[in-house]
Amino acid sequence: MRWCLLLIWAQGLRQAPLASGMMTGTIETTGNISAEKGGSIILQCHLSSTTAQVTQVNWEQQDQLLAICNADLGWHISPSFKDRVAPGPGLGLTLQSLTVNDTGEYFCIYHTYPDGTYTGRIFLEVLESSVAEHGARFQIPLLGAMAATLVVICTAVIVVVALTRKKKALRIHSVEGDLRRKSAGQEEWSPSAPSPPGSCVQAEAAPAGLCGEQRGEDCAELHDYFNVLSYRSLGNCSFFTETG
């Protein structure tokens, strides 16, 4: 039995309206999403705030059933979609090889006992590749220009600081030469030695840190934040709900 992590995306996160006041559960969905033609997308819903037992989850398009995950029977994919639809992650559904015709409403329907049926709605817009490519063509040079600007600024700062320190070092060398000779056993601080805190070498490294490590930490935080529950999928489709 595989354990899959249920990803609930922040963008477009919303609560679906419920059919009855007696039903306490809420469905969170990915809301309105867009994807590139030929690409893939994960449709996700999450039922929370109810102790009802989930017996089946349906994934439906406007006029057809895409897939079902039944507590007893496991996953079943529509024969029409078996080449383009993959179950999971979790109780979600992955749509592959997207076409413009895939644009439209998608529904996740949770069949529960004793509450009844909870429905979530997701609107998917599939964009032509050229739209995404145009965006990329615009963004890449922009990022390149920003990076180049940072490099130039940082290089200039390094040069200025290095020259300033060299001048200081020369002055110190000429005025206090004998003091340096007395402390010859101590490590000299020169531009070639490791830079102290606050120097431009660290500042130069900062853009890489911000664009690399920092972003990675952000991603890890988001990953940890949204992957709060794990779901058993495929096999017998065990369902869990969060009662908080």
Epitope: E60, D63, L65, I109, T119
Partner: nanobody
Amino acid sequence: EVQLVESGGGLVQAGGSLRLSCAASGPTFSIYDMGWFRQAPGKEREFVASTIWSRGDTYYADSVKGRFTISADNAKNTVYLQMNSLKPEDTAVYYCAAGVWSSLRHTAANWGQGTQVTVSS
């Protein structure tokens, strides 16, 4: 394959009511929607009403709107057609249909054997 069995047909006077039932069996998890069609003598089979199995959305032919009501009991895998204010032109064989994976409004994959409804004037 999904099997469908209708019941509830019969003879009724104009203005009267009837309730048709259709029980589904087999791999009912694959049902997208269920509904009713009818075929009057010498005419083509026509759509009457349907309901999306899981969401409860309902659709009706203009000729029956306001008089017929379709409903479903998912727990019993049964769909019902409540027919009120019946007219002689409602006389026909009523067929239950199940759209397996796809909507029966596009292609009805499974059919019941039909039940006769006769409205006398």
